[in-house]
Interface confidence: low
């Protein structure tokens, strides 16, 4: 049915879906706090611009009786049920914030008359790529894939003189929502990553992974996995690892590597960690003080979603344009707006751009050090440490195939 939008005459409402099934196990109260903090900032910015309007959020909760797995498995129906609730109440805001699960976002996008923008903290999967009115504020799988291909092909750095064309991918099905979709993208036979690699095998059992570490007949020296150091330790323990094995540990939403007192455990010496640049941490923020690093990124994406809406609202109001139009719904892309802790850039498809950081463990200091950074906005790698103190021979990353000479 046609739902009227509470989005005119100086009153602008944001519909926030508070779903029990979520990409990260974050208490809904924390997300509410993030949204409310965002609203305060937006009101201040609009007031400073001389725009005397009201901006509020309506939090839409599901009943939690049917969809209570807590993760994303039953999110498809929960998302549609919440939309039905909005439809029955005949009340929709100018913008929909949430859902975070790929399943629910994909289904909601398919099943709705999208004359309004949808902003998601999550929706990492490839199935949510290239959606005209969807904006994603946490790095989607496509961005990871582009980094990996870029890095695999790189062969002109002092520490990486070989192009790689092979990889193992460890994926055992117990991953968090972000990792699940990142690895899913790498596994998909039609994906850019698979297309660019000559050899790729998915390891699904712990034993398969453990055997590869010392297998002389392995087809690649490179193993991609997703999770934190503890996850790796549970799997690898203190097992011996062949000297030319390189483990790429994708752990994007984790600031712990940058903390001053962190020492890298010995089992991380064969590992390159891919994470996100920690941003403007010198500015201590009140809202993030009680959040763990991962949850901070999730709550921050909700907050930035509010700030993005405020940014677009300001532009449209200043230009005297209508908010309840397809033009507004399609405008949340190809722009940079003022986020909570610095600029946030969205690409042509509404996906957040970021600086990815590849870390290594220094054999001298046992500290994580930045090897290179990658700007997803320009698809460019910037080397940082030109003479890293690697565990690998000659302080260079090995070839991806044992015994193959220079290319």
């Amino acid at each position: 049915s046609q739902v009227s939008q509470n989005c005119h005459n100086g009153s602008y409402e944001i519909s926030v879906l508070m779903m029990g099934n979520s990409a990260f196990a974050e208490p809904l109260k924390n997300l509410e706090d993030a949204v409310n903090e965002g609203l305060e900032i937006v009101r201040g910015r609009l007031q400073n611009a001389g725009l005397n309007v009201t901006v509020n959020a309506t939090f839409m909760y599901s009943d939690g009786l049917i969809h209570n797995s807590g993760d994303c498995r039953s999110s498809t129906c929960e998302g549609l049920d919440l939309l039905r609730k909005i439809s029955n109440a005949q009340r929709m805001g100018c913008v929909l914030i949430g859902p975070s699960c790929t399943y629910s976002t994909f289904q909601m996008y398919l099943d709705t008359e999208l004359s309004y923008p949808m902003i998601s903290a999550g929706s990492f999967g490839l199935s949510c790529d290239y959606k005209e009115t969807l904006t994603r504020l946490m790095s989607p799988a496509r961005k990871l894939m582009y980094f990996l291909v870029n890095f695999w092909k790189t062969n002109d750095l002092p520490f990486k003189t070989y192009s790689w064309s092979t990889s193992y991918v460890y994926k055992n099905g117990t991953e968090t929502e972000d990792c699940f979709w990142y690895l899913n993208a790498l596994e998909a036979s039609v994906s850019y990553f698979s297309h660019e690699l000559g050899f790729k095998v998915v390891l699904r059992q712990d034993k398969e992974f453990q055997d590869i570490l010392m297998d002389h007949n392995r087809k690649s020296n490179v193993i991609i996995m997703c999770g934190g150091p503890e996850f790796l330790y549970k799997l690898k323990g203190d097992r011996a690892v062949a000297e030319d094995i390189v483990i790429i540990l994708v752990d994007l939403f984790n600031d712990q590597y940058f903390e001053d007192n962190v020492t890298a455990p010995d089992y991380m010496k064969n590992v390159l960690v891919l994470t996100l640049s920690p941003g403007n941490s010198l500015l201590n923020s009140s809202f993030s003080r009680n959040l763990s690093p991962t949850k901070r990124d999730f709550a921050l994406a909700y907050l930035n979603g509010i700030l993005l809406f405020g940014h677009m609202l300001k532009i449209f109001l200043e230009n005297g344009e209508n908010i309840t139009t397809p033009k507004f719904a399609h405008a949340f892309r190809n722009l940079t707006f003022e986020g909570y802790d610095g600029p946030v850039t969205l690409d042509d498809w509404g996906d957040v751009d970021s600086t990815m950081v590849l870390l290594y463990t220094s054999v001298d200091t046992k500290k994580y050090k930045v090897l290179l950074t990658y700007d997803t906005h320009v698809n460019k790698t910037y080397p940082v440490d030109m003479s890293p103190t690697f565990t690998w021979k000659n302080s260079k990353l090995p070839n991806d195939i044992t015994g193959r000479g220079p290319q």
Partner: nanobody, 115 residues
Framework: QVQLVESGGGLVQPGGSLRLSCAAS????????MSWVRQAPGKGREWVAK????????YYVDSVKGRFTISRDNAKNSLYLQMNSLRAEDTAVYYC????????WGQGTTVTVSS
């Protein structure tokens, strides 16, 4: 390669002025916050000032407020620190830093305030 090169330090009398410069290269300078950090002899690094990517917000440590001014020129990929009313306790090696990565530091530029 990401590089930061500081210049402009020197010996100055108390009450005098200096202008430090930092030339940045190897990253998209105009998208990142920049900072000045200093390290006095025998002490740890101390954050001095920080400026937003477009120059619209600036933050200072209390001890330099009203005396130091941070600025930037994105067209030239340059960061500046204007230091007035210098005191003996401002003596230090001054470094510029970027939020692009915390692992890159220049060689620093030495400021000595002494009569």
């Amino acid at each position: 390669q990401v590089q930061l090169v500081e210049s402009g330090g020197g010996l100055v009398q108390p009450g005098g002025s200096l202008r430090l410069s930092c030339a940045a290269s190897g990253f998209n300078f105009g998208r990142y916050w920049m900072s000045w950090v200093r390290q006095a002899p025998g002490k740890g690094r101390e954050w001095v000032a920080k400026i937003k990517y477009d120059g619209s917000e600036k933050y200072y440590v209390d001890s330099v407020k009203g005396r130091f001014t941070i600025s930037r020129d994105n067209a030239k990929n340059s960061l500046y620190l204007q230091m007035n009313s210098l005191r003996a306790e401002d003596t230090a090696v001054y470094y510029c830093a970027t939020d692009f990565t915390r692992d890159v530091w220049g060689q620093g530029t030495t400021v000595t305030v002494s009569s």
